[in-house]
Interface confidence: low
C-alpha cells in the first residue's frame, strides 16, 4: 500500500534504534571516508526529520522518496569533491540516476587501515560509558569497509557484540572472555560479508532472474516438504529483500526481511518442521536463525526425477508453454532431492538441462535426444566431488596454514600478474575452507566447500575488475557466476608470464617481525612465498618447501638470538643466497 510519507512509514515500522542503525549503515556504505562523528550528525538530522514526518505526514518534504532525502543529505556534505573526487558528480544527477551513481562508486577495497580491536579494558570502559555510541562506531567501521554488508545482519552482529561485551565486561578476566567470542563473531561476519557480496554481484551482473534461481535451489534444499508454489513465493520475497539491500534501500530491506520472517513463522506448517526454535527468538535473532536453519527431513516417497523431466511425453510441450516455470520446477525437484549438492552445482545442472531441451525440442525425435540428459550430469557432479576430496585430504595432511600455502602457490602460478597482497588475501580466505568445511559430515562438505569458494572467488574478480592484469582471471570472471569456480580450478601455470627478476630486498627481513602477532607473521611469510613463485613460476613443490623451511628456521633462530638485529643483518643475506641457489 502507498504511504503518504515513506520515511515516517519506515520509522514507525522499524522503531527508532533500528532506523538509526540502518541509516548509519547506509551513509557509511555510500561515503566510506567520512568519520563516525560526521555520519552520526547526519543520522541525527535524518532521524529528527523522520520524527517530524511521523507527527505530521503532510509536513514539508515528508512525501519525498528515501533516495531523494538521503541523497540530498549526502550531497550537502562540505568538501565532498575534495574528499571523494568524481563521486561528487553524482550530485549533479536526478533520482534514480543519482543513487545508481552512488552505488557505482562504492569501493570494495577502500584504503582504510584494518579495523583494530582496542584492548579489553579500554573497550569495556567505552562500552559501559555509552553503549549506543560504542555500537554506532562498530556499525560505522564495519559498514564502510564492507559497502555491501547485509544491513539487517549487521544489526544482528552488533547485537551479538553488545551481548558479548555485556557478559565479558562483568568478568574479572575480560581479555580471555572477550577474545575468543569476538573472534568468532568477526569470522562469521566476514563470511557473511563475502556471501552477501556474491548475492549482490549476481543481482548486478545477471539480474533478478539469476538470483531467484539461486534462491529456489537454496530454499528447496532447506525446505523439501514445501510445495513449489510456497518455494516460489519465498524465493520472490527473498529476491526483493536482497535487491533492496544491494541497491542501498536498507530501510525497505530490513522491513521486508522482518515481514518475510513473520510470514515464515506464521506458515511453518506448509514450509518446514524445523522453524519453531527460530520463531521463538526476537526479530534480529529470528531472521538470522531462519537464514541458516537446518534442512528439513526429506519426504520418503519422492518419485524419481526422470518421470516428469525425461520420461513424460509432454516434456517439450510443458517446456515451450512456460519455460521459466518448467525449469523452475526442475530446479525445485532436483534441489529438494539433493541437500548434499552445492547451489552452484544445482544451477549448473539446471543450465545443462535447459541447454539440452533447447537443442532437443527443436529436433524431430526429442525424447531420443534428451533421454540421456541425466547421465550427462555425471561428469558435472563428479568434478566438484573430486575437488572436495582432493582438497580436504590435502587440508588434513597440511593443516590450515600449510593448506593456505599450497593454494597460494597454485593461484600464484595460475595468475602471477595479480598483486601479491590480493593473492595472499585470496589464498588465506580460500584456505579457510578446510577448517570451515572439511570437518563437516560427508553430505555437507560439497555444498559448504563449493559455495564458500565461489563467494571468495567473487571477491577476487571484483578486486581484479578494478585493475585487470591477468587474462586468465579476466576469462574466468567474465563467465557466469556458477562457472567461475570450475574455471579457476581448471587454470594451469600461466605460460605467457615473464618471471620477475630476483630482488634481494623482497626477501630481506628485520627484527620487528619477531614481535608481530602470529597472523601478521604468517602474512609476511606468505608474501615472500608468492614473490618466490613469481620469480620461479615453475619451481617444484620440493624446492619451495626447502626454501620456506629454511626461511622459518632463519626466523626462529634470529628471533631467539640475544642480539636480534645483528642476527638479521648477518644471516639475512646468507638466506637470500641459499634461496637463489635452491631455486636455480
Amino acid at each position: 500500500e502507498a504511504h503518504k510519507s515513506e520515511i515516517a512509514h519506515r520509522y514507525n515500522d522499524l522503531g527508532e534504534q533500528h532506523f538509526k542503525g540502518l541509516v548509519l549503515i547506509a551513509f557509511s556504505q555510500y561515503l566510506q571516508k567520512c568519520s563516525y562523528d560526521e555520519h552520526a550528525k547526519l543520522v541525527q538530522e535524518v532521524t529528527d526529520f523522520a520524527k517530524t514526518c511521523v507527527a505530521d505526514e503532510s509536513a514539508a518534504n515528508c512525501d519525498k522518496s528515501l533516495h531523494t532525502l538521503f541523497g540530498d543529505k549526502l550531497c550537502a556534505i562540505p568538501n565532498l569533491r575534495e574528499n571523494y573526487g568524481e563521486l561528487a558528480d553524482c550530485c549533479t544527477k536526478q533520482e534514480p540516476e543519482r543513487n545508481e551513481c552512488f552505488l557505482q562508486h562504492k569501493d570494495d577495497n577502500p584504503s582504510l587501515p584494518p579495523f583494530e580491536r582496542p584492548e579489553a579494558e579500554a573497550m569495556c570502559t567505552s562500552f559501559k560509558e555509552n553503549p549506543t555510541t560504542f555500537m554506532g562506531h562498530y556499525l560505522h567501521e564495519v559498514a564502510r569497509r564492507h559497502p555491501y554488508f547485509y544491513a539487517p545482519e549487521l544489526l544482528y552482529y552488533a547485537e551479538q557484540y553488545n551481548e558479548i561485551l555485556t557478559q565479558c565486561c562483568a568478568e574479572a578476566d575480560k581479555e580471555s572472555c572477550l577474545t575468543p567470542k569476538l573472534d568468532g563473531v568477526k569470522e562469521k561476519a566476514l563470511v557473511s560479508s563475502v556471501r552477501q557480496r556474491m548475492k549482490c554481484s549476481s543481482m548486478q551482473k545477471f539480474g533478478e532472474r539469476a538470483f531467484k534461481a539461486w534462491a529456489v535451489a537454496r530454499l528447496s534444499q532447506t525446505f523439501p516438504n514445501a510445495d513449489f508454489a510456497e518455494i516460489t513465493k519465498l524465493a520472490t520475497d527473498l529476491t526483493k529483500v536482497n535487491k533492496e539491500c544491494c541497491h542501498g534501500d536498507l530501510l525497505e530491506c530490513a522491513d521486508d526481511r522482518a515481514e518475510l520472517a513473520k510470514y515464515m513463522c506464521e506458515n511453518q506448517a506448509t514450509i518446514s518442521s524445523k522453524l519453531q526454535t527460530c520463531c521463538d527468538k526476537p526479530l534480529l535473532k529470528k531472521a538470522h536463525c531462519l537464514s541458516e536453519v537446518e534442512h528439513d527431513t526429506m519426504p520418503a516417497d519422492l518419485p524419481a526425477i526422470a518421470a516428469d523431466f525425461v520420461e513424460d511425453q509432454e516434456v517439450c510441450k510443458n517446456y515451450a508453454e512456460a519455460k521459466d516455470v518448467f525449469l523452475g520446477t526442475f530446479l525445485y525437484e532436483y534441489s529438494r532431492r539433493h541437500p548434499d549438492y552445492s547451489v552452484s552445482l544445482l544451477l549448473r545442472l539446471a543450465k545443462k538441462y535447459e541447454a539440452t531441451l533447447e537443442k532437443c525440442c527443436a529436433e524431430a525425435n526429442p525424447p531420443a535426444c534428451y533421454g540421456t540428459v541425466l547421465a550427462e550430469f555425471q561428469p558435472l557432479v563428479e568434478e566438484p566431488k573430486n575437488l572436495v576430496k582432493t582438497n580436504c585430504d590435502l587440508y588434513e595432511k597440511l593443516g590450515e596454514y600449510g593448506f593456505q600455502n599450497a593454494i597460494l602457490v597454485r593461484y600464484t602460478q595460475k595468475a602471477p600478474q595479480v598483486s601479491t597482497p590480493t593473492l595472499v588475501e585470496a589464498a588465506r580466505n580460500l584456505g579457510r575452507v578446510g577448517t570451515k568445511c572439511c570437518t563437516l559430515p560427508e553430505d555437507q562438505r560439497l555444498p559448504c566447500v563449493e559455495d564458500y569458494l565461489s563467494a571468495i572467488l567473487n571477491r577476487v574478480c571484483l578486486l581484479h575488475e578494478k585493475t585487470p592484469v591477468s587474462e586468465h582471471v579476466t576469462k574466468c570472471c567474465s563467465g557466469s557466476l556458477v562457472e567461475r569456480r570450475p574455471c579457476f580450478s581448471a587454470l594451469t601455470v600461466d605460460e605467457t608470464y615473464v618471471p620477475k627478476e630476483f630482488k634481494a630486498e623482497t626477501f630481506t627481513f628485520h627484527s620487528d617481525i619477531c614481535t608481530l602477532p602470529e597472523k601478521e607473521k604468517q602474512i609476511k611469510k606468505q608474501t615472500a612465498l608468492a614473490e618466490l613463485v613469481k620469480h620461479k613460476p615453475k619451481a617444484t613443490a620440493e624446492q619451495l618447501k626447502t626454501v620456506m623451511d629454511d626461511f622459518a628456521q632463519f626466523l626462529d633462530t634470529c628471533c631467539k638470538a640475544a642480539d636480534k638485529d645483528t642476527c638479521f643483518s648477518t644471516e639475512g643475506p646468507n638466506l637470500v643466497t641459499r634461496c637463489k641457489d635452491a631455486l636455480a
Epitope: 559501559k128 553503549p131 549506543t132
Partner: nanobody
Framework: EVQLVESGGGLVQPGNSLRLSCAAS????????MSWVRQAPGKGPEWVSS????????LYADSVKGRFTISRDNAKTTLYLQMNSLRPEDTAVYYC????????SSQGTLVTVSS
C-alpha cells in the same frame, strides 16, 4: 546468570501515572548502562529511555520526553521508569535491557492505558 525481572505494570486511565521497576542480578549492575524498551501489540520493539551506569546521564525517545523519568538505585541493583501523563499510545509490554540492546531477554511487564 544474568536475570532481569520487571514489575509495576497494570491498567491505568489516560493522564495517570505508573512506576516500573526492573530488578537485576548476575552482573555488576553499576558498571552498565541500562535501557527501557517497549513493544506494542503487532509492532517492533521501540527504545524508550537509557541511563548510564553512574546514573548521571539519561536519554529519552521524543515520544516520552518530559513525561517519563528513568532512574536507578545501584545499591539495590534496580532500574526504574516513572511514567506520568500516560496516553493510550503508551500501551505496550515494557522490558529493561542491558546497554542499548533491543533484544528482549525477560518477560517484561504489560502497561495498558485505557479509559
Amino acid at each position: 546468570e544474568v536475570q532481569l525481572v520487571e514489575s509495576g505494570g497494570g491498567l491505568v486511565q489516560p493522564g495517570n501515572s505508573l512506576r516500573l521497576s526492573c530488578a537485576a542480578s548476575g552482573f555488576t549492575f553499576s558498571s552498565f548502562g541500562m535501557s527501557w524498551v517497549r513493544q506494542a501489540p503487532g509492532k517492533g520493539p521501540e527504545w524508550v529511555s537509557s541511563i548510564s551506569g553512574s546514573g548521571h546521564d539519561t536519554l529519552y525517545a521524543d515520544s516520552v520526553k518530559g513525561r517519563f523519568t528513568i532512574s536507578r538505585d545501584n545499591a539495590k541493583t534496580t532500574l526504574y521508569l516513572q511514567m506520568n501523563s500516560l496516553r493510550p499510545e503508551d500501551t505496550a509490554v515494557y522490558y529493561c535491557t542491558i546497554g542499548g540492546s533491543l533484544t528482549r531477554s525477560s518477560q517484561g511487564t504489560l502497561v495498558t492505558v485505557s479509559s
